[in-house]
């Protein structure tokens, strides 16, 4: 069985301020078991944008229903985009661990650029 890959097909996305950004991500396998998280930026200072396992993120909705057990589409929508949302977003697969889940594989990233609202 081939190892899971995290695919972010869009290298960049351009969204007008006030609109909704769709950031696409799919996994190629259900194995290993574990959640997906989305981050803006990389490294220790990265910002958590969405965590499948915990919490409610008011501006973020998933494109597909993650409660479905065979789901492999982890794309998200971020509403009411502002210039402060610009950056590179990474879709990251975690492997279930105890006590903490372990980062398993990251997508290549999608750069979100924000176009100013026409005046």
């Amino acid at each position: 069985e081939e190892e899971l890959q995290v695919i972010q097909p869009d290298k960049s996305v351009l969204v007008a301020a006030g609109e909704t950004a769709t950031l696409r991500c799919t996994a190629t396998s259900l194995i290993p078991v574990g959640p997906i998280q989305w981050f803006r930026g990389a490294g220790p200072g990265r910002e958590l944008i969405y965590n499948q396992k915990e919490g409610h993120f008011p501006r973020v909705t998933t494109v597909s229903d993650l409660t479905k057990r065979n789901n492999m589409d982890f794309s998200i929508r971020i509403s009411n985009i502002t210039p402060a949302d610009a950056g590179t977003y990474y879709c990251v697969k975690f492997r279930k661990g105890s006590p903490d889940d372990v980062e398993f594989k990251s997508g290549a990233g999608t750069e979100l650029s924000v176009r100013a609202k026409p005046s």
């Epitope: 915990e54 919490g55 409610h56 008011p58 229903d65 479905k68 903490d100």
Partner: antibody, heavy 120, light 107 residues
Framework: QVQLVESGGGVVQPGRSLRLSCAAS????????MIWVRQAPGKGLEWVAS????????YYADSVKGRFTISRDNSKNRLYLQMNSLRAEDTAVYYC?????????????WGQGTMVTVSS | DTVLTQSPDSLAVSLGQRATINCGAS??????MHWYQQKPGQQPKLLIY???NLEAGVPSRFSGSGSGTDFTLTISSLQAEDVAVYYC?????????FGQGTKVEIK
């Protein structure tokens, strides 16, 4: 098999405190968000509070905010509900339930409940 | 808050007949609607999750449908053991909310 067993209910006077406990077994407790739901006598279900698997995210119903505190101890496989400043309208059966992964998931197992009666 | 309204409040159906319960949401909950069964003196039991998915071990006579604001739970052929109160519940956004419940009885 999955088991959730609530305890700590009883009769208490208005304004007093009570601490409910829920003992979990038969599953990896630290993988699951946990919830308290209550049901007043002859009434429907009301969500009270929820806590994520690592306690990072906690939410309360407006009706209990500032009075109730939900917590968990993953090393002991236990969920708690500390209830302060109890009111007559808090009288209900209190159920603990588990929720796999994130906020959108359903409550797939429930305990049998523990009765809390607030009365002078 | 998202208000869930079930209809009817109670329902009497002959054995072997179809029972249909509706749940309307005050705003879209996408597909994050779940259905529970509660028999007298027992805790609730999950029947259907995310609008249309049958929970493991639940008889196939139970089914769910809908998305957005309108959802339906159907019992295709009512059995005596289905006498219970049925609740819908949304998990699209906090706070979690339940419908007021629908009591199903045998006619």
């Amino acid at each position: 098999q999955v088991q959730l067993v609530e305890s700590g209910g009883g009769v208490v006077q208005p304004g007093r405190s009570l601490r409910l406990s829920c003992a979990a077994s038969g599953f990896t407790f630290s993988d699951y968000g946990m919830i308290w739901v209550r049901q007043a006598p002859g009434k429907g279900l009301e969500w009270v509070a929820s806590i994520s698997s690592s306690s990072s995210y906690i939410y309360y119903a407006d009706s209990v905010k500032g009075r109730f505190t939900i917590s968990r101890d993953n090393s002991k496989n236990r969920l708690y509900l500390q209830m302060n400043s109890l009111r007559a309208e808090d009288t209900a059966v209190y159920y603990c339930a588990r929720r796999y992964y994130g906020f959108n998931y359903p409550f797939d197992y429930w305990g049998q409940g523990t009765m809390v009666t607030v009365s002078s | 808050d998202t208000v869930l309204t079930q209809s009817p409040d109670s329902l009497a159906v002959s054995l072997g007949q179809r029972a249909t319960i509706n749940c309307g949401a005050s705003k879209s909950v996408r597909t994050y609607m779940h259905w529970y069964q509660q028999k007298p003196g027992q805790q609730p039991k999950l029947l259907i999750y995310s609008a249309s998915n049958l929970e493991a071990g639940v008889p196939s006579r139970f089914s769910g449908s809908g998305s957005g604001t309108d959802f339906t739970l159907t019992i295709s052929s009512l059995q005596a053991e289905d006498v219970a109160v049925y609740y819908c519940q949304q998990s699209n956004e906090p706070p979690y909310t339940f419908g007021q419940g629908t009591k199903v009885e045998i006619k």
